[in-house]
């Protein structure tokens, strides 16, 4: 029975040219995490394997950095980076848990303006 839940950073926005941290956290389960996959729509960005560590997909190695923790840092953001990101936790005995993050990439001035009106 799958009792765990994934908490994510939810909907986030960041400036074009800037960087953003994608974070997920699996809680409420004693399942062992064997691997975390980070995907953007249908593209695999990176994995963190419990035995062998981080592996970044060749097409993203210049703009993706592992961490912090099981999170992922996206750098030099472009408008093409906007959209859905998924963290997929491979665990046993539970199976897979999936979290979703939606990233909006804004022009610098818009991002700064939006930040003044964020609800804490």
């Amino acid at each position: 029975m799958m009792t765990g839940t994934i908490e994510t950073t939810g909907n986030i926005s960041a400036e074009k040219g800037g960087s953003i941290i994608l974070q997920c956290h699996l809680s409420s389960t004693t399942a062992q995490v064997t691997q975390v996959n980070w995907e953007q729509q249908d593209q695999l960005l990176a994995i963190c394997n419990a035995d062998l560590g981080w592996h970044i997909s060749p097409s993203f190695k210049d703009r993706v950095a592992p961490g912090p923790g099981l999170g992922l840092t996206l750098q030099s953001l472009t408008v093409n980076d906007a959209g859905e990101y998924f963290c997929i936790y491979h665990t046993y005995p539970d199976g897979t848990y999936t979290g979703r993050i939606f990233l909006e990439v804004l022009e610098s001035s818009v991002a700064e303006h939006g930040a003044r009106f964020q609800i804490p």
């Epitope: 064997t34 062998l52 560590g53 491979h90």
Partner: antibody, heavy 121, light 107 residues
Framework: QVQLVQSGTEVKKPGASVKVSCKAS????????ITWVRQAPGQGLEWMGW????????NYAQKLQGRVTMTTDTSTSTAYMELRSLRSDDTAVYYC??????????????WGQGTLVTVSS | DIQMTQSPSSLSASVGDRVTITCRAS??????LAWYQQKPGKVPKVLIY???TLQSGVPSRFSGSGSGTDFTLTISSLQPEDVATYYC?????????FGGGTKVEIK
């Protein structure tokens, strides 16, 4: 096409070491892991350990810990497995295989042809 | 460590028969299980991964099922070329232990 080509048959004396090579072609070597599996004559498959060709991280079977070392050379797309302090029960065919871990399911999708290592005095 | 137990250790069946091999994990592993076929004198070959996903190029008479601790490999209609030893393997994390194998022969 993906190919893993292993080094040839070895005959060793007890207490010696052996180093088996596994040359990969047909894919981006550093994007996958390599595992080593052995099979004693007439016996089943025994997992020995695996190594990431991306970062060099390893994980070995507990019973071989301290006697086995797995390495990779990305410049030649070659994986190596060294086994030390050989005993007669290390006589086996040694296989390397590519691990598809991107899916999260860690299965061995391509295998080398095997290297027979005989340990005999 | 999680142990993998296969049964039977050997079986003999007629061409066209439905053949079932079982694999049991000592603890739950969800669907992190692969099946391999090793023909006499040949290199092992993956048939199924993720418990039920058929590897590309594998005939559709092979199928896998199960989750948790109990898994099954089924050959829907045994063919002469299926004579081999079949191994299950836990594929979640190290150690990536194999079952003891099931030898399939033709009657």
């Amino acid at each position: 096409q993906v190919q893993l080509v292993q080094s040839g048959t070895e005959v060793k004396k007890p207490g010696a070491s052996v180093k088996v090579s596994c040359k990969a072609s047909g894919y981006t070597f550093s994007s996958y892991a390599i595992t080593w599996v052995r099979q004693a004559p007439g016996q089943g498959l025994e997992w020995m350990g695996w190594i990431s060709a991306y970062n060099g991280n390893t994980n070995y079977a507990q019973k071989l810990q301290g006697r086995v070392t797995m390495t990779t050379d990305t410049s030649t797309s070659t994986a190596y497995m060294e086994l030390r302090s050989l005993r007669s029960d290390d006589t086996a065919v040694y296989y390397c295989a590519r691990v598809d871990f991107w899916s999260g399911y860690n299965y061995f999708d391509y295998w080398g042809q095997g290297t027979l290592v005989t340990v005999s005095s | 460590d999680i142990q993998m137990t296969q049964s039977p250790s050997s079986l003999s069946a007629s061409v066209g028969d439905r053949v079932t091999i079982t694999c049991r994990a000592s603890q739950g592993i969800s669907n992190y299980l692969a099946w391999y076929q090793q023909k006499p004198g040949k290199v092992p070959k993956v048939l199924i991964y993720a418990a039920s996903t058929l590897q590309s190029g594998v005939p559709s008479r092979f199928s896998g099922s199960g989750s948790g601790t109990d898994f099954t490999l089924t050959i829907s209609s045994l063919q002469p070329e299926d004579v081999a030893t079949y191994y299950c393997q836990k594929s979640n994390s190290a150690p990536l232990t194999f079952g003891g194998g099931t030898k399939v022969e033709i009657k």
